[in-house]
Amino acid sequence: QAAPFPELCSYTWEAVDTKNNVLYKINICGSVDIVQCGPSSAVCMHDLKTRTYHSVGDSVLRSATRSLLEFNTTVSCDQQGTNHRVQSSIAFLCGKTLGTPEFVTATECVHYFEWRTTAACKKDIFKANKEVPCYVFDEELRKHDLNPLIKLSGAYLVDDSDPDTSLFINVCRDIDTLRDPGSQLRACPPGTAACLVRGHQAFDVGQPRDGLKLVRKDRLVLSYVREEAGKLDFCDGHSPAVTITFVCPSERREGTIPKLTAKSNCRYEIEWITEYACHRDYLESKTCSLSGEQQDVSIDLTPLAQSGGSSYISDGKEYLFYLNVCGETEIQFCNKKQAAVCQVKKSDTSQVKAAGRYHNQTLRYSDGDLTLIYFGGDECSSGFQRMSVINFECNKTAGNDGKGTPVFTGEVDCTYFFTWDTEYACVKEKEDLLCGATDGKKRYDLSALVRHAEPEQNWEAVDGSQTETEKKHFFINICHRVLQEGKARGCPEDAAVCAVDKNGSKNLGKFISSPMKEKGNIQLSYSDGDDCGHGKKIKTNITLVCKPGDLESAPVLRTSGEGGCFYEFEWHTAAACVLSKTEGENCTVFDSQAGFSFDLSPLTKKNGAYKVETKKYDFYINVCGPVSVSPCQPDSGACQVAKSDEKTWNLGLSNAKLSYYDGMIQLNYRGGTPYNNERHTPRATLITFLCDRDAGVGFPEYQEEDNSTYNFRWYTSYACPEEP
């Protein structure tokens, strides 16, 4: 029997039942490699509470249709007194990426999964040349899912401060250059997920091979390698490779575009700080609303409830389905059943079944999918209780006053599936928006202006046009709602600009769209503020103008008009200046745009060195000076000593040339002991200094060796700009 979804065959996939602490391993074409589940298990269930394994689907007992895979077993189970076999059922829906199998629910006998994937699409329009799984579960079974970052056309430009080359990447799949309007990518070879553009030429420097990996819980890693045998002439005989490390942002709130952190011998190290790398909670509720502070999610489906005897009707060929959400169906022939979903046979309307009851309801928000499940309906002939799964999709232009209507999509073993497009399923997630702008290779980052939490304070705009008695206070935050503190305490919760006067407070606009580069300045538009009459809402424009060295000046109110519907502010700030790379001497570096000066000379040890230990090695490093430790070479800035035999390697000659770019200060030591390879590549050290105001001098942390460079990270207060 041919594999039904060949694109999904190369991997063993994972799904999780978080409520019951169960991890499922799924291999839809072969068997999972888990001894405890037997040699032919396609779906293996690992119960972490009881530390037991059970096969809940056998690869030999597979049956498939276009949208459903069933794996039976020979294991008996008891449901409602009838004898059945344990089985797994995977319902497939068309998606735009390979996607992830999602656990839906489990009864005594059936384990239900749903999988939105390109493999289930009738047409190949979303299918990639090369794509790998793009999610992982951590030890606590929390999901980290990068699928939302996958670009279906075009690519991400990696921020690398090199004007002569541009590195473009996609996440977990190759770059689709055909559908991308940008001419730069047209020359990229097919299959590449990392494309280096030099002048008019484009080179494949990496293709996806393995899925996303979790390293040390807080970091996800994706590796691309060049498959072709031919070497690239600018790589000094090395094979190109790309490693992208995705980092869940810390409280420091760094930017959210991929940054090149190391580049030597065509080994590209990219760090990408993004909220998609954080774990995504599964939010569940037994009511019709749910909210999750961590994701900034708030959902309420109660406006969809029908009353006064009316229901939603969905046509299912032989049957009509009468549905209500957040309440029982009040159709006459259903109402004794306390049904939320009521199934009526068209040819015989006396045949009425409850396909899920209002009291047995679960609303789940998981990885961007909003699902309402109704359990506990009338039994089928097999003994299973009918159940309905409604997948909600956001549609801001849905009919029926935005409510939309449910559409029956199919039935699988007495489980009825519906999709429902409605504006009430729209969830604005904070990850969607960047706090910066790009203009070709030029990059702008406004994150220095963001105020996150107390003791920070909102920016207050200057308004010289008013007398003290009629004074309005204008509180502004950038890319973030205003903090409800001080005079802004009464401001509407989601306002990014707020006006406060003696009559109260007003929302002058929300952060809904990312900043834009316009006419040499950065424009930030806040919209959807309070009503201002004639069905209009208040809108605010902020024009940010580059002023090197100034992160202290406040925004200024320029105009307000259209009957209080429009406000315009101007803000002269260093945050609106283009990011540029600067190099310094004598252990200092000056960022001329922002006006920051950094001096790391207090970290230099006049005698000795900083010692960092790992299991096998001791590392000795100094900052802007040589290590003076036996047995290290006297002019080395860093050296490595094997614990077993004291063998020593010079990891680079010391120097005091710091470089600064976008909040990162780096010190590079080159020309160390050559490797014993063809090219005799000299070892090098890269120390990245990051701001931590509490750390004092701080300490170096060894991160990893990537081919020829030893990477250290160092949080220190000396890497912090003077606070404005």
Partner: nanobody, 114 residues
């Protein structure tokens, strides 16, 4: 709520030993670099030792060979074994977690009498 609770401090004679513990709760412990800092009266707070989430270890020069930092991810605890204590080691010792967020403990007093 994140909490770091230090224990094990006290009064000890020069040349003696103490073992400090710092129990963490409310955070994904294994993702954090854990460090011990100390602050002697009238002096700035300084780092003593640190252990990263990838188990790279740092000891400040003045304590090398005498102090040993270690961690037990299963117990969400970081330790500082202090041997051959000197009068200049007298200080309040603070535990610090640095990762997706930064947190400090309240401190534990170590007094070394000569």
């Amino acid at each position: 709520e994140v909490q770091l609770v230090e224990s094990g401090g006290g009064l000890v004679q020069a040349g003696g030993s103490l073992r400090l513990s710092c129990a963490a709760s409310g955070l994904t412990f294994s993702s954090y670099t854990m460090a011990w800092y100390r602050q002697a009266p009238g002096k700035e707070r300084e780092v003593v030792a640190a252990i990263s989430s990838g188990d790279s270890i740092y000891h400040e020069g003045s304590v090398q060979g005498r102090f040993i930092i270690s961690r037990d991810n299963a117990k969400n605890t970081v330790y500082l074994q202090m041997n051959s204590l000197k009068a200049e080691d007298t200080a309040v010792y603070y535990c610090r977690a640095n990762g997706p967020g930064t947190y400090w403990g309240q401190g534990t007093q170590v007094t070394v009498s000569s």
